[in-house]
């Protein structure tokens, strides 16, 4: 009696159970009654990542440098090539297919977390004590001066975007 | 497919207004949503996105002193406390991608706003 | 941020001529660039993204060229209907899509 459903890495074709191609091969021709499933490697910048019956390889991904992106990891016959953006830039989606440009965190935020190359800079404003007073994609928010610890006085209090500024104490005649 | 702004009208310096991008014919999950504005026989000034995802960007300049936000249908842009240099005709435009790295393919009319005392 | 330089500010071409304008990054967007085409009291068209890509509907008289920081917009077989301003956009994403200061054509 013909078999309904075959084993894993086997497909049913005219009622027979073929092998599978594995990874990094094509199905060339289905088994039959006296021969195994033929299979061939994927060529030059193709590839098959799974046990399949697939009759063409597909394509590595281009990972075209007019749209700032690069090679991150060069494919192989059973894997696609992985592209990432260049530096200053990070890609849209998991698929990478094209970049954005960091953002900055402007005067009175600043870096949470840097951004790399799949992920974009997290600002966060400066708390009471700290500021930024420049945009940038890598500064953290800084400390006011602590006057006290020069023996000066704050002459003009701090801002998230502005540090405070120290002047001498009044001295007692 | 289109987009339509809303809200524009006369107010004096200081007072909130909320122009409304009202969008049909697409999803709003699916594309990013830009705010323009061009002030009276002036050039474009670009303000800021909110993309697919919900992600709201504003350029360096709009920075406090726009809103955005959206519904299922419309995008919000709030100018929090106008002054007599808000004066121009806004206009929402759609990306042609989710993301924020994408032209704008559909343009709304746009609404002219005018503040003055 | 990202400045865009659009020059010249205006040009001037009989019909039937070719018209070529610049526009410059002030830092490399790749081919992050969109052009657009508005007329008087009318909201911007978008003519060319992603440098060179022709938007749908539109002519194939407009092409644009370039990527890095430069730039180039140009109208070939110029028509009467072609008479407005253009302007360039950076597409980098983010804060960084600002537009050009825009380059008005006359058709003579």
């Known amino acids: 009696e013909p078999p309904t459903a075959c084993r894993e890495k086997q497909y049913l074709i005219n009622s027979q159970c073929c092998s599978l191609c594995q990874p990094g091969q094509k199905l060339v021709s289905d088994c039959t009654e006296f021969t195994e499933t033929e299979c061939l490697p994927c060529g030059e910048s193709e590839f098959l990542d799974t046990w399949n019956r697939e009759t063409h390889c597909h394509q590595h991904k281009y990972c075209d440098p007019n749209l700032g992106l690069r090679v991150q990891q060069k494919g192989t016959s059973e894997t696609d090539t992985i592209c990432t953006c260049e530096e200053g830039w990070h890609c849209t989606s998991e698929a990478c297919e094209s970049c954005v440009l960091h953002r900055s965190c402007s005067p009175g935020f600043g870096v949470k977390q840097i951004a790399t190359g799949v992920s974009d800079t997290i600002c966060e404003p400066c708390p009471v004590g700290f500021f930024s007073n420049v945009s940038s994609a890598f500064e953290k928010c800084h400390p006011w001066t602590s006057c006290e610890t020069k023996d000066l006085v704050v002459q003009q209090a701090g801002t998230n975007k502005t540090d405070v500024v120290c002047g001498p104490q009044d001295r007692l005649r | 497919q289109s987009v339509e702004e809303s809200g524009g009208r006369l107010v004096t310096p200081g007072t909130p207004l909320t122009l409304t991008c009202t969008v049909s014919g697409f999803s709003l999950s699916a594309y990013a949503i830009h705010w323009v504005r061009q002030a009276p026989g002036k050039g474009l000034e670009y303000i800021g996105i909110?993309?697919?995802?919900?992600n709201i960007v504003y350029a360096t300049w709009a920075l406090g002193r726009f809103t955005i936000s959206k519904t299922s249908t419309t995008v919000d842009l709030k100018i929090t406390s106008p002054t007599t240099e808000d004066t121009a005709t806004y206009f929402c435009?759609?990306?042609?991608?989710?993301?924020?790295?994408?032209?704008?393919?559909?343009w709304g009319p746009g609404t002219l706003v005018t503040v003055s005392s | 941020d990202v400045v865009m330089t659009q020059t010249p500010a205006s040009v001037s071409e009989p019909v039937g001529g070719t018209v070529t304008m610049k526009c410059q990054a002030s830092q490399n967007i790749y081919t992050y660039l969109a052009w657009y085409q508005q007329k008087p009291g009318r909201p911007p068209k978008l003519l060319i993204y992603q440098a060179s890509t022709l938007a749908s509907g539109v002519s194939s008289r407009f092409s644009g060229s370039g990527s890095g920081t430069e730039f180039t917009l140009t109208i070939s077989d110029l028509e009467c209907a072609d008479a407005a301003t253009y302007y360039c956009?950076?597409?980098?994403?983010?804060?960084?899509?600002?537009f050009g200061g825009g380059t008005e054509v006359v058709v003579k």
């Open positions: 909110i993309d697919a995802g919900g």
């Open positions: 435009g759609r990306g042609l991608s989710s993301y924020s790295n994408s032209a704008m393919d559909l």
């Open positions: 956009q950076s597409t980098a994403g983010n804060a960084y899509n600002a």
